[in-house]
């Protein structure tokens, strides 16, 4: 009883449970190929408890190993149009700080319109996520076809 | 020590533990673009610890965030048949309550025969997941190419 | 503050907390169409907090429901090179004990050069997981295009 | 409900062609392949191949290829099956057929036959 | 290509009994949880009627006195009990794979 009573009080944050789920917002201007991506029960399903969102990109609050996914899928797209403008390449990765710069998770679209992976790793208070889609295909904002998040899974 | 036997005495299900993970059972007839599913240990691998079936559509038991994912292969497929098949597409979505409708995870085939993804999203006890396969080609009913299934992640 | 010194107090693996992350080390010889995994701090982003490595397999050290996700791209591939080399398949199984030997998450590249999938299954002690690569394109060994991991859910 | 109608019973000379035609009821036409049979009392029932209206593409059963043409205009939701070098061999029923609901080569609906008869 | 052995060539069963019919293919025609064997009835001058898809599958407006078993390389179909409309002549046929092959039929008679 007391261990439930306890774990009531807590707040969940505290609990380590850090999760967010995004939707597309834009792409970036043309030289910048990072998506950026927008979370909040007003924009319908997407949220965001633990990490934030810094300038469109997702900050880390809790160190941890957490689960990340991705879903995107490409506008106007067949498989004509997928291999014509391949390579169209997706990649994941903690962009800041600098330091820690690294790539996390890539994926090429080659005669497909969606990819969608996952992957678990350390993530450490302070990273700042990055997706990266380079070629000429704008992706779908449909929230059921483009989504990015992340799941923290043990300290 | 008092914590974990208050760990060891407390339900599951009081946890917040909720998971599932479905086998394909058939399709509809005709009009109903519904997956039937199935689940339990004498079927093999598949399970329900929490949600329940409801005529082989999944309900939520438990309010939460949820980890959705899905995979399904069609069956005697080749890239040229995905192609010529085309748009063959499957969305997960909450069917019922009408009320909460919605679209929560759609792909298309193209030119591939298995289309496999996962998404984090805000499920309410009630709700009921449908998996729609549009198209005329059959999902595999193979344990290893063709499941579905849930899992709690938080409150 | 008793619950949460006492969460602090436990060591994580009695939480059940395992989890791993694996990176490709390398291919079988000629007729083992297993993947040999490697992990560790001192890899990279790989790790394994609970299950073994076991000549490159994974070994699961405690019994429950299981989150088993890869993803394995093809080396110095196209869709023209992964449809003349079809059938390219990965399959995640157990491969020992032999009792319990099953295949879990089967998947084609068909005209794609990256699978990525995941699964909910239940795994026990002892049980050794294999990936078997068919065919005779070479997988990357990129950590960022492909791994293979498993994280504990629940008992 | 899909109807497939044939064209009429066909006398032909040894060696000479025949094209006979399939037609389709309802707006399905495009989205699943057309297969053509042929029925003969020694040789019971073979598939001869398939289109698919869609994009015009074929498959032929080995022991057909370079025997059948198969053609289909999606305008008039009309598949077409030329048979060449005709032979007594060739005389048969020959059948348009597809599935109803899942594209496989099974066949819920059938055309009513076209007779085609080679005799001198 | 698959080869179909049905069997029997005939049959001759009393109105209201069983009527059993058998369909071997020269290897497998399962895959991915199916068995793609259909049965098919034809009588004098008319095209062949599907009954059953998918070795099992009663097919909309068959009756139910039909039915299918079997998987792999052997499969069944049952008429039971049979009736006067059933005299025709029953194909079995596989979609396993390219070429689909029909089995040589069974003429059912009525005594």
């Known amino acids: 009883q007391r261990f439930a009573q306890a774990q009531q009080q807590l707040p969940l944050e505290s609990l380590g449970w850090d999760v967010a789920e995004l939707q597309l917002n834009h792409t970036g201007p043309q030289q910048d190929p990072r998506l950026y991506w927008q979370g909040g029960p007003a924009l319908g399903r997407s949220f965001l408890h633990g990490p934030e969102l810094d300038k469109g990109q997702l900050r880390i609050h809790r160190d941890g190993i957490y689960m990340v996914h991705i879903q995107v899928t490409l506008a106007i797209c067949s498989s004509t149009t997928a291999s014509r403008h391949h390579p169209t390449t997706l990649a994941v990765g903690i962009c800041s700080p600098a330091s820690r710069s690294i790539s996390l998770l890539r994926l090429s679209f080659h005669q497909g319109c969606t990819i969608a992976s996952q992957r678990l790793t350390p993530l450490a208070r302070g990273d700042t996520l990055c997706t990266n889609l380079t070629g000429t295909l704008l992706p779908s904002r449909n929230t059921d076809e483009t989504f990015f998040g992340v799941q923290w899974v043990r300290p | 020590q008092r914590f974990a036997q208050a760990q060891q005495q407390l339900p599951l299900e009081s946890l917040g533990w909720d998971v599932a993970e479905l086998q394909l059972n058939h399709t509809g007839p005709q009009q109903d673009p519904r997956l039937y599913w199935q689940g339990g240990p004498a079927l093999g691998r598949s399970f329900l610890h929490g949600p329940e079936l409801d005529k082989g559509q999944l309900r939520i038991h438990r309010d939460g965030i949820y980890m959705v994912h899905i995979q399904v292969t069609l069956a005697i497929c080749s890239s040229t048949t995905a192609s010529r098949h085309h748009p063959t597409t499957l969305a997960v979505g909450i069917c019922s309550p009408a009320s909460r409708s919605i679209s929560l995870l759609r792909l298309s085939f193209h030119q591939g025969c298995t289309i496999a993804s996962q998404r984090l999203t805000p499920l309410a006890r009630g709700d009921t997941l449908c998996t729609n396969l549009t198209g005329t080609l059959l999902p595999s009913r193979n344990t290893d190419e063709t499941f579905f299934g849930v899992q709690w992640v938080r409150p | 503050q008793r619950f949460a010194q006492a969460q602090q107090q436990l060591p994580l693996e009695s939480l059940g907390w395992d989890v791993a992350e694996l990176q490709l080390n390398h291919t079988g010889p000629q007729q083992d169409p297993r993947l040999y995994w490697q992990g560790g701090p001192a890899l990279g982003r790989s790790f394994l907090h609970g299950p073994e490595l076991d000549k490159g397999q994974l070994r699961i050290h405690r019994d429950g429901i299981y989150m088993v996700h890869i993803q394995v791209t093809l080396a110095i591939c196209s869709s023209t090179t992964a449809s003349r080399h079809h059938p390219t398949t990965l399959a995640v199984g157990i491969c020992s004990p032999a009792s319990r030997s099953i295949s879990l998450l089967r998947l084609s590249f068909h005209q794609g050069c990256t699978i990525a999938s995941q699964r909910l299954t239940p795994l026990a002690r002892g049980d050794t997981l294999c990936t078997n690569l068919t065919g005779t394109l070479l997988p990357s060994r990129n950590t960022d295009e492909t791994f293979f991991g498993v994280q504990w859910v629940r008992p | 409900q899909v109807q497939l109608k044939q064209s009429g019973a066909e006398l032909v000379k040894p060696g000479a062609s025949v094209k006979m035609s399939c037609k389709a009821s309802?707006?399905?036409?495009?989205?699943?392949?057309m297969h053509w049979l042929k029925q003969t009392p020694g040789q019971g029932l073979e598939w001869i191949g398939a289109?698919?209206?869609?994009?015009?593409?074929?498959s032929y059963n080995q022991n057909f290829k370079g025997k059948a043409t198969l053609t289909a205009d999606k305008s008039s939701s009309t598949a077409y099956m030329q048979l060449n070098s005709l032979t007594s061999e060739d005389s048969a029923v020959y059948y348009c057929?597809?599935?109803?609901?899942?594209?496989?080569?099974?066949?819920?609906?059938w055309g009513q036959g076209t007779l085609v008869t080679v005799s001198a | 290509d698959i080869v179909m052995t049905q069997s029997p060539a005939s049959l001759d069963v009393s109105l209201g009994q069983r009527a059993t019919i058998s369909c071997r293919a020269s290897k497998s025609v399962s895959s991915s949880g199916y068995s793609f064997m259909h049965w098919y009835q034809q009588k004098p001058g008319q095209p062949p009627k599907l009954l059953i898809s998918l070795a099992s599958n009663l097919e909309s407006g068959v009756p139910a006195r039909f039915s299918g078993s079997g998987s792999g390389t052997d499969f069944t179909l049952t008429i039971y009990p049979v009736e006067e409309e059933d005299a025709a002549t029953y194909y079995c046929?596989?979609?396993?794979?390219?070429?689909?092959?029909f089995g040589s039929g069974t003429k059912l008679e009525i005594k």
């Open positions: 289109i698919f209206p869609g994009n015009g593409e074929t």
């Open positions: 046929q596989h979609s396993r794979e390219f070429p689909p092959t």
């Open positions: 309802g707006d399905t036409f495009p989205r699943y392949n």
């Open positions: 057929a597809r599935n109803s609901y899942y594209d496989y080569a099974w066949f819920t609906y």
